[in-house]
């Protein structure tokens, strides 16, 4: 960071390495919770038209797919992987692709994925063979 750009103490809006290089924030689909028609498919597009700049450079893209007796929803957000989301740790935050993993939630089917390439939560992947065989 050049000297004229102040670095505030304990500020999480800027991430730098030892050489002063600055980390750019992630670009993620960010439509919060929307009704979805994504069901029984190997992968789905988010159908979210909003690509937002994540507020903090350490945040990653997240997608949450939920199905209950009444509806299906897809949530797309930015989130800090150091913090749980919906009470779950974002284990796959460094992945370039958003590969859905099922989580135990009573009364619904709940899948979540996280990833760290631009707009990676636009394409959510459920396919088991992708999970196990794709080196990406």
């Amino acid at each position: 960071i050049p000297p004229h750009v102040q670095k505030s103490v304990n500020n999480d809006m800027i991430v730098t390495d030892n050489n002063g290089a600055v980390k750019f924030p992630q670009l993620c689909k960010f439509c919060d919770v929307r009704f979805s028609t994504c069901d029984n498919q190997k992968s789905c597009m988010s159908n979210c038209s909003i690509t937002s700049i994540c507020e903090k450079p350490q945040e990653v893209c997240v997608a949450v797919w939920r199905k209950n007796d009444e509806n299906i929803t897809l949530e797309t957000v930015c989130h800090d992987p150091k913090l749980p989301y919906h009470d779950f740790i974002l284990e796959d935050a460094a992945s370039p692709k958003c590969i859905m993993k099922e989580k135990k939630k009573p009364g619904e089917t709940f899948f979540m994925c996280s990833c760290s390439s631009d707009e990676c939560n636009d394409n959510i992947i459920f396919s088991e063979e992708y999970n196990t065989s794709n080196p990406d």
Partner: nanobody, 124 residues
Framework: EVQLLESGGGLVQPGGSLRLSCAAS???????RMWWVRQAPGKGLEWVS?????????YYARSVAGRFTISRDNSKNTLYLQMNSLRAEDTAVYYC?????????????????WGQGTLVTVSS
Amino acid sequence: EVQLLESGGGLVQPGGSLRLSCAASGFTFTEYRMWWVRQAPGKGLEWVSAIEPIGNRTYYARSVAGRFTISRDNSKNTLYLQMNSLRAEDTAVYYCAKQIPGRKWTANSRFDYWGQGTLVTVSS
């Protein structure tokens, strides 16, 4: 030598508008995603808006979406930020920065990626 020179800041009343410019030189402008970044007094950097080198795809922070518009003129090597419906919380020094698309970090040069900034003050 890479240079980014911001201009267009000033004092404006709440609800008013300003247009910032960033004149770029010393690098191939059309190879870089360009950003507007701001720093309010005593606060950290906030990443406001970005635009792709070609195709003019744009991105905004949620705090400014719908009020700010980023654009670029590749023939003039210039980046713009049109700011409407300004609020007191938009008061900050505004910088432009360049990014190779897909690269997560700036280069290690502390001076390569930042101009001196232009001050925007929103006050009645």
